[in-house]
Interface confidence: low
């Protein structure tokens, strides 16, 4: 969902603009830039919404069917854990948990970008929250996993294995309350805004352009920025210790949680480049041209459509790079299916390094 | 109630400067792009000014630019026109008007329109 | 700068009458807006997005057109609906106005 989608005439204030190019009467797609910033009325987005007509519907179903089973399948196996779940673990049940809330969301946008909102304004504002409590919470705990990695590996505290369990539902506690906190603008400013241009309803922001603006740099540092500096100085430094120390299982062991995060990296850098580029011309340090903001449209939902795939992209990193979640899930799936023949399934090592499926810890690991 | 009061009309002579006040009330006046448009006795109308909600952008049609200054204070609710090298057919009657507001988004129309200050420009 | 014309410039009509105003573009736009004015006020927006009727704005009044060629029409014309009425323009800069057409009582 991108929730910037916006009326076709816009005075778009970067601040407004009826006004921020050169284009002709006809409308064409003029890469002409004004040195006067404002000799024209606002840029016609036709363009832009009739391709998310076309291509966000069918995205958003299909990542919501596939979120959906992705991440069912990930809680299940967590769940079905009889001894009590790791630090890492906990955080990816949790990720796994903000990633299912997110793509629940997703048919809502969809019928969004397909027809109209047709939820109302209550269900505007929970679902515009839901899908951004959800998005930062996804990148802060895979920060989280990946400090509490650095806390393991690099200076063998284990903050949270030795000390009271509380202490990662705390910290988990502390993303959602943060995440809720970032959220808040969602509450306020989001409803259902009758478009008498398109002569639909929409779900969208109603506030000052510099609000706006606000709101995207924080998206884009507290929500990704932010995460991606902790996840990178912290992996590089467990991957320095790890070659430093020839650990070769203790390497494999990482492999799932860099994957990971090289997965978060890829799946929403496009789309914080395409917000970057949007800033910038709200800031007027890139002069906005129709060309130019039509191709921005577009790119942000294309870009945000990959950034969402990421919500299904970690099942199915578990399911080919994480060796104990392919067990697990089998054994799961064995249950399930045959509940009289459980001497049918390979029982588990008993051995304490079994004990998740994620870790990487002097007292746990797995050769994943 | 929307409101929007236009003062600072008047008498003045060929070159001579003015400047026009509209006071804005009724609905948050930092979020509206506001423009002047003027009409001569007897005449049309003919837009004059826009400036953005935050005062960054401004935009005159050849008639007025280079002469008239469009404005505003967001702190006193207030947009201004100043109009110097004032000629003849300058002479209208001044309306301020807000552009009304979709979706976080501005339309150039205008939904809203103060009574209008004369200006006559005479000498 | 596009500009508007509208016709006629003056229209006498009775109540009852139904009444088409024109307003015609120099080159096309996408969407006009009217705007109804009584003698010494300020105008009033009365159509949108060339078909939308504005806030209080009774439905005998109706707009259309697209293109070059735009048009106004009041079914049944009521006594206060003599007033002069603009058509306008914002698909190019600068917006312009029409010239006005004055509906005037036979």
């Known amino acids: 969902m991108v929730l910037e989608v916006s009326d076709h005439q816009v005075l778009n204030d970067a601040e407004v603009a009826a006004l921020l190019e050169n284009f002709s009467s006809s409308y064409d797609y003029g890469e002409n830039e004004s040195d006067s910033c404002c000799t024209s009325p606002p840029c016609p987005q036709d363009f832009s919404l009739n391709f998310d007509r076309a291509f966000l519907p069918a995205l958003y179903s299909l990542l919501f069917l596939l979120g959906l089973l992705g991440n069912g399948a990930v809680a299940a196996v967590l769940l079905s854990r009889r001894t009590a779940l790791s630090s890492t673990d906990t955080f990816l049940l949790h990720l796994a948990v903000a990633d299912t809330l997110l793509v629940l969301t997703l048919p809502l946008w969809a019928v969004d970008a397909a027809v109209q909102w047709v939820f109302g304004s209550g269900l505007c504002k929970v679902a515009g929250a839901l899908f951004n409590i959800n998005f930062y919470a996804g990148a802060l705990l895979l920060a989280c996993i990946s400090f509490d990695r650095y806390l393991n590996i690099v200076h063998a505290t284990q903050l949270y294995r030795r000390g009271p369990p509380a202490r990662v539902t705390l910290t988990c506690l502390a993303v959602w309350g943060l995440c809720l906190l970032f959220a808040l603008p969602d509450f306020i400013f989001l409803s259902a805004h009758h478009d008498e241009r398109l002569n639909a309803t929409h779900c969208q922001y109603n506030f000052p352009q510099v609000g706006r603006t606000a709101l995207r740099v924080l998206q884009l540092v507290a929500g990704f920025l932010l995460p991606l500096l902790v996840m990178a100085y912290c992996y590089a430094h467990i991957l320095a210790v790890l070659l430093v120390s020839r650990g070769q299982r203790r390497l494999r062991a990482m492999r799932l949680v860099v994957v990971v995060v090289v997965a978060f990296a890829l799946c929403w850098t496009p789309y914080h480049l395409v917000v970057l580029v949007d800033i910038l011309m709200d800031l007027g340090a890139l002069a906005r041209n129709c060309g130019r903001e039509s191709r921005v449209d577009v790119a942000k939902s294309v870009t945000s459509g990959l950034g969402y795939m990421h919500c299904c992209l970690n099942p199915l990193l578990y399911a080919f790079v994480g060796v104990k979640f392919r067990e697990r899930m089998w054994m799961l799936l064995l249950r399930l299916g045959c509940p009289n023949q459980r001497g049918l399934q390979r029982q588990p090592s008993s051995s304490r390094r079994d004990s998740s499926w994620s870790e990487t810890s002097e007292a746990s690991y797995s050769g994943l | 109630e929307v409101q929007l009061l236009e003062s600072g009309g008047g008498l003045v002579q060929p070159g001579g400067s003015l400047r026009l006040s509209c006071a804005a009330s009724g609905f948050t006046f930092t979020s509206y792009a506001m423009s002047w448009v003027r009409q001569a006795p007897g005449k049309g109308l003919e837009w004059v000014a826009v400036i953005s909600h935050g005062g960054t952008y401004t935009y005159y049609p050849d008639s007025v630019k280079g002469r008239f200054t469009i404005s505003r204070d967001n702190a006193k609710n207030t947009l201004y026109l100043q109009m110097n090298s004032l000629r003849a057919e300058d002479t209208a009657m001044y309306y301020c008007?807000?552009?009304?507001?979709?979706?976080?988004?501005?339309?150039?129309?205008?939904?809203?329109w103060g009574q209008g200050t004369l200006v006559t420009v005479s000498s | 700068d596009i500009q508007l014309t509208q016709s006629p410039s003056f229209l006498s009509a009775s109540v009852g009458d139904r009444v088409t105003i024109t307003c015609r573009a120099s080159?096309?736009?996408?969407?006009i807006y009217w705007y109804q004015q009584k003698p010494g006020k300020a105008p009033k927006l009365w159509i949108y997005?060339?078909?939308n009727l504005a806030p209080g704005v009774p439905s005998r009044f109706s707009g259309s057109g697209s293109g070059n060629e735009y048009t106004l029409t009041i079914s049944s014309l009521q006594p206060e609906d003599f007033a002069t009425y603009y058509c306008q323009q914002f698909t190019s800069s600068p917006y312009t106005f029409g010239g006005g057409t004055k509906l005037e009582i036979k």
């Open positions: 997005f060339t078909s």
């Open positions: 008007a807000r552009h009304p507001i979709y979706s976080g988004n501005y339309q150039g129309y205008f939904d809203y």
């Open positions: 080159s096309g736009v996408n969407y």
